[in-house]
């Protein structure tokens, strides 16, 4: 798997999308996990609803939300109030039994808020020793969720 880079601004929301073949992954729940080291395990952050037919319901774990468009084949993860410690390598996963298929490897980069004049030394970027070959950069422009916003796709 190539690694896709998503860049977000500290303090704002970052939306990560993971497209997949909806038929191939039909009936499978999804998860978002954080890679612990280059060869380490991927630690589960949040997973979709335990009933696959309700996968479109937004589920939160702390400041991270997940929602799955199972018909369209797009898993969406929202990292709210992005912080420097959120930077790192993640995976979108498709679950089947105790196994997990990787849908996409994601590198989250946290950029300094241009309106924030604090020391940018806290921000994390992949070092030269960490090679993410063929990494594709996606600048994700997202908005913060509004209070009381319905956690469902909009009506047509």
């Amino acid at each position: 798997h190539n690694t896709t880079v998503f860049q977000g601004v500290a303090g704002q929301s970052l939306q990560v999308s993971c497209p997949y073949d909806s038929m191939k992954h039909w009936g499978r729940r999804k998860a978002w996990c954080r890679q612990l080291g280059e060869k380490g395990p991927c630690q589960r952050v949040v997973s979709t609803h335990n009933l696959w037919l309700l996968s479109f319901l937004r589920r939160w774990n702390g400041s991270t939300a997940i929602t799955d468009d199972t018909l369209g084949g797009t898993l969406t993860i929202t990292l709210r109030n992005l912080q420097p410690h959120d930077a790192g390598l993640y995976q979108c996963q498709s679950l089947h039994g105790s196994e997990a298929d990787t849908l996409r490897k994601v590198l989250v980069e946290v950029l300094a808020d241009p309106l924030d004049h604090r020391d940018a030394g806290d921000l994390w970027f992949p070092g030269e020793s960490e090679s993410f070959e063929d990494a594709h950069v996606e600048h994700s422009i997202s908005r913060s969720l509004l209070e009381g916003e319905i956690p469902f796709p909009p009506t047509s």
Partner: antibody, heavy 126, light 106 residues
């Protein structure tokens, strides 16, 4: 008029099978997820399972206590949802209701149930 | 599974009274909660969805509020036709109902 009518209930011995039907009218049946619930005499409501709209191709979900014994299916041409109940136990005795999930847009629905049938009684006893 | 604790299990109030029922979830369910009314011998009827949204055609004297683990259902002015059992239902994890609250007229 939007309506759901259940049928097929009755007295059945433990270990036997029974099939309930839920006939829908007044709405486009294929656009909606359909669910089954039950209510034991004098008790509260319990979700049994549901089946997705036509877009989901008959995908089903069940509560743990009936998984492997009960099967939900739907016939779009007749606008009927079925609940096939096998290996029935005395604790399955209840009024069984079918209900329609609220619809948001194509494929998307809401697990709030806005139309219910009148219910059909299932008694499992020897 | 998420447990839904509804209280009180029964109450008696006068016509015109404000009636409040609470539902507590065993863990955070955001606003994934619905309220139903069930009259004796009848099927349940959806009143409130997403914790606070009034279902179409339901009188405005019914309302719901809350998020996280604590939810409230209110009848602002009890009417004779409101005699029923009221249930909360969560859908954050599977689907489970509260034990119900039976509302009677004094």
């Amino acid at each position: 008029e939007v309506q759901l009518v259940e049928s097929g209930g009755g007295l059945v011995q433990p270990g036997r099978s029974l099939r309930l039907s839920c006939t829908a009218s007044g709405f486009t049946f294929g656009d909606y997820a359909m669910s089954w619930f039950r209510q034991a005499p004098g008790k509260g409501l319990e979700w049994v399972g549901f089946i997705g709209s036509k877009a989901y191709g008959g995908t089903t979900e069940y509560t743990a206590s009936v998984k492997g014994r009960f099967t939900i299916s739907r016939d779009g041409s007749k606008s009927i949802a079925y609940l096939q109940m096998n290996s029935l136990k005395t604790e399955d005795t209840a009024v069984y209701y079918c209900a329609r999930g609220k619809r948001y847009s194509y494929g998307y629905w809401h697990p709030a149930f806005d139309v219910w049938g009148q219910g059909t009684m299932v008694t499992v006893s020897s | 599974d998420i447990q839904m604790t509804q209280s009180p299990s029964s109450l008696s109030a006068s016509v015109g009274d404000r009636v409040t029922i609470t539902c507590q979830a065993s863990q955070d369910i955001t606003n994934y909660l619905n309220w139903y009314q069930q009259k004796p011998g009848k099927a349940p009827k959806l009143l409130i969805y997403d914790a606070s949204n009034l279902e179409t055609g339901v009188p405005s004297r019914f309302s719901g509020s809350g998020s996280g683990t604590d939810f409230t259902f209110t009848i602002s002015s009890l009417q004779p036709e409101d005699i029923a059992t009221y249930y909360c239902q969560q859908y954050d994890s599977y689907l489970t109902f509260g034990g119900g609250t039976k509302v009677e007229i004094k």
